[in-house]
């Protein structure tokens, strides 16, 4: 079997470490004899054989440490994980999820009172009690808030017409408040009749155009804890409930309001004051803060607008959407299955990604099934323990900063994991930690440009001209991002990752990220492009490699030949064509264009004796073959037969 | 632990009113809701009506309203159930109950209508 | 009011056997369903609600199922201390309604 410590040529200690788990480095004097490269670098086994003492060998190990003192999560354990990891070794270890008996649960209504939701909102005065005894069985401590919204007031949302700019809803011959973006009315309580006296004091407003400001109330919502009064220790609910759709980043440069959103809590006198100056948050970035938050979301949604919220539900982790019927008689059971659904779904998703740690998480359920972390469990009841299988592999050593810290958390809750990288890329013999001995290999010491002395090299920077570290000689050196050492670039370390290259012009941290993982956590990044790891692809790395079957065709075509396979769905790059194998193209076959007369040949049905000859004689050269699959869909398709 | 501790026996004339309490130990008293059941002999059991004390709310059975009365005195932590026009059908045993996942039923109070 | 029909009205079983109890509702309850028990001494314990949750400290031989306006309470495994009348109860609308209740005793 192939040996890549002795076969790669590794000409230090950091080197041979780097090319793989079995590697070690033997760092004594006398080891090397005839000279021959890279004797230094082996499998440990080879190297005690050739005569290296085992306390002479830097084998760094890859330890788990879990300590048992000071925990202090009852719910996700262990809470501190610190992992040595060595380049391309992997660690185990295993996180036990115990959902708790009985949560206190803080539910907030955040309500879009827009004028069409008039009826929605009447049926809120009464939710108050009902909910409470319905919700008796699953807290016992359950608190209710309410806060409402409508959108930007600002043209084009809401009219500017100065009769209407103060009753958006005349049209409706409604008294209506003034259009908000979205109001904090009342902090989460105990109190049901203080909830309902807010809910009915409540009054409709309206808008223009039929999206609405949502997404920026509910990021006020998540982020304004102490306003809000979200309680650390609750299940946050916040119940969304609208009948349309919800403006995203960026519409809001209509009105000029160009500045994004930060994410940041601006309320004001219970006011959200940055409404008009602001864009509406992203949905990677109103996910991240529902999750950081610990929330969990239900859109109740009426009418036709529930499936534009059912489609967003993979992009916002831990949130439900539910269908509310005329006059929102079943939003009590919406709350209810919505807590339920939640509560007894156990996922994990993995926060503050430490560059070049790569977790790959199994989560085995109580009935004994294996799903994807990012899957979870279902049907967990309180006296069940979920299991996380979760595997830390570091591929490359080629990181700057020693130690760092990745944070597994398990949606909703309000416990997490810490796991603390600890990256053992250096020798001992590099840093005087250990006694000295050789970490570099001499065999490759290039005498022109290294000194040695006593294991210390220094580099003679005048034999070289810099010209040799630039792509171009208008160029900087090395990219601006390196130095030119020896004749040879060597870049900078710097935070976002990894610069490399001939003259430091590639790097891997300019790569498409997909749901907030580089290279969708499945592949590296290199030159701006994710090099899919085995049994992925896509340019982000975000689809199974098997998706690509599902774009080809009965004759074996990949798209018809008219497009690309993104995810196992063909995006069709000839603007004409469209199917699902971008196989109806209309105007694509010129053949039937240009042969028209003497396509009716390959089909003689129905026709005249005149046009018959005419085959015989015009057409008669015509490699009639050649067309026969194309002129089939010449015929069955719809422009042909007009 | 959540208990609950109802007044004895009662032996009433038709036509009269009783009061039975219902006295609640263990746990917070304005935030459980109370329910009140009734069972007469060899039948079974029938809703009266409920009362949440943190917010004075109750609600009734419409079979009982008008008749019955429930009400919560928060420093004694204690709920009554007063039932008025006494006839030989409300010969039963009363029970008073926490509502939710902690649900404990007392053992009831018996009360015997006669004339 | 939402009706209660509860069936059988009693029935007899063997120490080890599996029993279910059935109730069904004139409307649908959407599985705001309890069930309780009633030893022959009167005490009453709530066994499953929400239609299919167990109560804390129930065995796990109980279990309840159904949705809509059809549920059912199984007891596998039967033991002396089951012997005792079940009741289901909707707390769906006010006014909340039990069933007419299922005597369970020992063969």
């Known amino acids: 079997e192939d040996n890549r410590c002795a076969s790669s040529n590794a000409a230090s200690c950091a080197r041979c470490l780097a090319l793989g788990p079995e590697c070690g480095w033997c760092v004594q004097e006398d080891f090397i004899s005839g000279g021959s490269r890279s004797e230094r670098c082996d499998i440990v086994s080879n190297l005690i054989s050739k005569g290296c003492s085992v306390d002479s060998i830097e084998y760094p190990s890859v330890h788990v440490i879990i300590p048992t003192e000071n925990e202090i999560n009852t719910q996700v354990t262990p809470g501190e994980v610190s992992i040595q990891l060595r380049p391309g070794a992997e660690a185990n270890f295993m996180l036990k999820v115990h959902p708790l008996k009985k949560y206190p649960v803080d539910l907030y209504y955040l309500v879009d009172v827009s004028a069409s939701m008039h009826n929605n909102i009447e049926k809120l005065n009464s939710v108050g009690n009902d909910l409470s005894r319905k919700m008796a069985f699953f807290s016992r401590d359950f608190r209710l808030g309410f806060g409402s919204y409508v959108d930007k007031t600002v043209s084009p949302y809401i009219s500017i017409h100065p009769e209407r700019i103060h009753n958006q809803c005349s049209d409706y011959n409604l008294d209506c408040m003034p259009p908000h973006g979205y109001i904090h009315v009342l902090s989460l309580t105990e109190n049901i009749t203080e909830f309902e006296k807010a809910v009915h004091r409540q009054k409709i407003s309206g808008n223009i155009d039929t999206p609405e400001g949502g997404f920026d109330a509910m990021l006020q919502a998540a982020v304004c804890e102490s306003h809000i009064g979200w309680r650390k220790e609750a299940k946050r609910l916040l119940l969304v409930m609208t009948d349309q759709t919800s403006h995203l980043a960026l519409d809001s440069k209509l009105a000029g309001i160009v500045v994004p959103n930060d994410g940041n809590c601006h309320l004001k006198n219970n006011v959200y004051v940055k409404s008009t100056t602001m864009e509406h948050p992203s949905l990677g970035q109103l996910s991240e803060k529902l999750i950081d938050n610990n929330i969990n979301v239900i859109f109740a949604v009426q009418g036709k607008q529930f499936h534009w919220y059912k489609d967003l539900l993979p992009l916002l982790p831990g949130t439900i959407a539910g269908e509310i019927e005329s006059k929102a008689a079943n939003l009590n059971n919406l709350v209810v299955e919505a807590y339920q659904k939640l509560i007894s779904e156990v996922k994990v998703q993995v926060e503050n990604q430490v560059q070049g740690i790569y977790f790959n998480i199994t989560a085995i359920c109580p009935d004994g099934s294996r799903k994807p972390g990012m899957e979870g469990c279902r049907n967990v009841t309180s006296n069940d323990e979920v299991l996380f299988n979760v595997t830390v592999t570091m591929k490359k050593c080629d990181v700057t900063g020693g130690k760092n810290y990745a944070i597994i958390k398990p949606i909703g809750f309000n416990e997490t994991a810490k796991i603390h990288i600890h990256r053992n890329c250096s020798c001992q013999c590099e840093d005087n930690r250990g006694p000295k001995g050789k970490c570099v290999d001499e065999t490759f010491l290039d005498s022109k440009c290294f000194q040695c002395d006593e294991n210390k090299c220094h580099f003679d920077e005048d034999q070289f001209s810099s010209e040799s570290c630039k792509s171009h000689k208008d160029q900087p050196v090395c990219s601006g991002r390196g130095v030119c050492v020896c004749g040879k670039c060597s870049c900078h370390k710097i935070k976002l990752g990894k610069v490399y290259g001939k003259y430091c012009e590639k790097d891997d941290f300019s790569c498409p990220y997909h749901h907030g993982n580089l290279c969708a956590g499945h592949g590296e990044c290199e030159a701006g492009r994710c090099q899919c790891f085995s049994g992925w692809e896509g340019d982000r790395c975000q689809c199974p490699s098997a998706a690509a079957q599902h774009c080809v065709n009965s004759k074996g075509q990949v798209c018809s030949g008219r497009g690309t396979c993104v995810c196992g769905r063909c995006e069709c790059t000839d603007p004409r064509s469209i199917g699902r194998f971008c196989e109806h193209c209309p105007t694509c076959y010129t053949a039937c264009k240009e042969n028209w007369n003497c396509m009716q040949c390959l089909h003689p049905h129905n026709l005249s004796q005149a046009i018959l000859d005419q085959c015989k004689t015009s057409c008669a050269l015509m490699e009639q073959q050649h067309y026969v699959d194309q002129t089939s869909e010449c015929f069955s398709s719809p422009s042909y037969l007009r | 632990e959540v208990q609950l501790q109802q007044s004895g026996p009662e032996l009433m004339k038709t036509g009269a009113s009783v009061k039975i309490s219902c006295k609640a130990t263990g746990y917070t008293f304005s935030t459980y809701w109370i329910e009140w059941v009734k069972q007469r002999p060899g039948h079974g059991l029938e809703w009266?009506?409920?009362?949440?004390?943190?917010?004075?709310?109750?609600n009734y059975n419409e079979k009982f309203k008008g008749r019955a009365t429930i009400t919560a005195d928060r420093p004694s932590n204690t709920s009554y159930m007063q039932l008025s026009s006494l006839t030989y059908g409300d010969s039963a045993v009363f029970y008073c109950?926490?509502?939710?996942?902690?649900?404990?039923w007392d053992h009831g109070t018996s009360v015997t209508v006669s004339s | 009011d939402i009706e209660m029909t509860q069936s059988p009205s009693s029935l007899s079983a063997s120490l080890g056997d599996r029993v279910t109890i059935s109730c069904s509702t004139s409307?649908?309850?959407?599985?705001?369903l309890n069930w309780y028990q009633q030893k022959p001494d009167g005490t009453v314990t709530l066994l499953i609600y929400?239609?299919?949750n167990l109560h804390s400290g129930v065995p796990s031989r109980f279990s309840g199922s159904g949705s809509g306006t059809d549920y059912s309470l199984a007891i596998s495994n039967l033991e002396p201390e089951d012997i005792a009348t079940y009741y289901c109860?909707?707390?769906?609308?006010?006014?909340?309604?039990f069933g007419g209740g299922t005597k369970l005793e020992i063969k």
């Open positions: 409307q649908d309850v959407s599985s705001y």
């Open positions: 929400y239609a299919s």
């Open positions: 109950a926490t509502w939710g996942w902690d649900t404990y």
């Open positions: 109860q909707q707390y769906s609308n006010l006014p909340y309604t």
């Open positions: 009266i009506g409920h009362t949440l004390p943190g917010s004075g709310t109750t």
